[in-house]
Interface confidence: medium
Amino acid sequence: GPETLCGAELVDALQFVCGPRGFYFNKPTGYGSSIRRAPQTGIVDECCFRSCDLRRLEMYCAPLKPTKAA
């Protein structure tokens, strides 16, 4: 049956997928956009109440930021 991911296990899996980038519990939308949007479906809705795969988890990783050469 479908598997769900909740609580600390959800955080652990997000850390596995996202690494130190961090993650959001609500999917960021329209980076740089000032348009107000309807409330987003969050990762708890998608992965705890329903089931999701690792690619779905990746959608909640913080966006990649350009990094300067050290």
């Epitope: 296990e9 652990d12 690494g19 913080a62």
Partner: antibody, heavy 115, light 105 residues
Framework: QVELVESGGGLVQPGGSLRLSCAAS????????MSWVRQAPGKGLEWVSY????????GYADSVKGRFTISRDNSKNTLYLQMNSLRAEDTAVYYC????????WGQGTLVTVSS | DIVLTQPPSVSGAPGQRVTISCTGS????????VHWYQQLPGTAPKLLIY???KRPSGVPDRFSGSKSGTSASLAITGLQSEDEADYYC?????FGGGTKLTVLG
């Protein structure tokens, strides 16, 4: 000390099934997510599957999705990989690895898929 | 998807310093932790460097890791014959193709 010991590998025909096991000791088993990683002969490492520390969540590489099932028994400190519909390209040494950094690995078990 | 590119092989004489690069594709690996693994011939991989530059206990300080922009590097100083092995970088569940290190002489 941490020890991971895989077993269950062998020769199987294409389309066949095999179940791998990974027995763990030397650490708090139920606190760590686990993964299976494989290495085809003469090739590099390929992550296969992930299971969360309580076992309620699993993830798979696209190459094995729908054919392989990862599971764990936290009462026996054992990780499993059920492999169905095996293909020649699944031939590899299969390793279990601890945590999200793969900080400890088993010695590996060889799976050969051939007719 | 992230693709990590490593040189297929590097070599050096005993006592020398060698570096192995790990370059990310379109995704910028600068925001990820990079881990390095050593695989001696006929053995399982072993974690060598984690979180870009940290060494697990028991790993000699001849091994060091660094990261800059879209690439990471593993440096080995004072090369020894027992360092001859395959080296892999990784980010989360993605591995580089591996680099075979040959110690000359």
């Amino acid at each position: 000390q941490v020890e991971l010991v895989e077993s269950g590998g062998g020769l199987v025909q294409p389309g066949g099934s095999l179940r791998l096991s990974c027995a763990a000791s030397g650490f708090t088993w139920s606190s760590f997510a686990m993964s299976w990683v494989r290495q085809a002969p003469g090739k590099g490492l390929e992550w296969v599957s992930y299971i969360s520390y309580l076992g309620s969540y699993t993830g798979y590489a696209d190459s094995v999705k729908g054919r392989f099932t990862i599971s764990r028994d936290n009462s026996k400190n054992t990780l499993y990989l059920q492999m169905n519909s095996l293909r020649a390209e699944d031939t590899a040494v299969y390793y279990c690895a601890r945590g999200t950094k793969f900080d400890y690995w088993g010695q590996g078990t060889l799976v050969t898929v051939s007719s | 998807d992230i693709v990590l590119t490593q040189p297929p092989s590097v070599s050096g004489a005993p006592g020398q310093r060698v570096t192995i690069s790990c370059t990310g594709s379109s995704s910028n690996i600068g925001t990820y932790d990079v881990h390095w693994y050593q695989q001696l011939p006929g053995t399982a991989p072993k974690l060598l460097i984690y979180s870009n530059s940290k060494r697990p206990s028991g790993v000699p300080d001849r091994f060091s890791g660094s990261k800059s922009g879209t690439s990471a590097s593993l440096a080995i100083t004072g090369l020894q014959s027992e360092d001859e092995a395959d080296y892999y970088c990784s980010i989360t569940r993605v591995f580089g193709g591996g680099t075979k290190l040959t110690v000359l002489g």
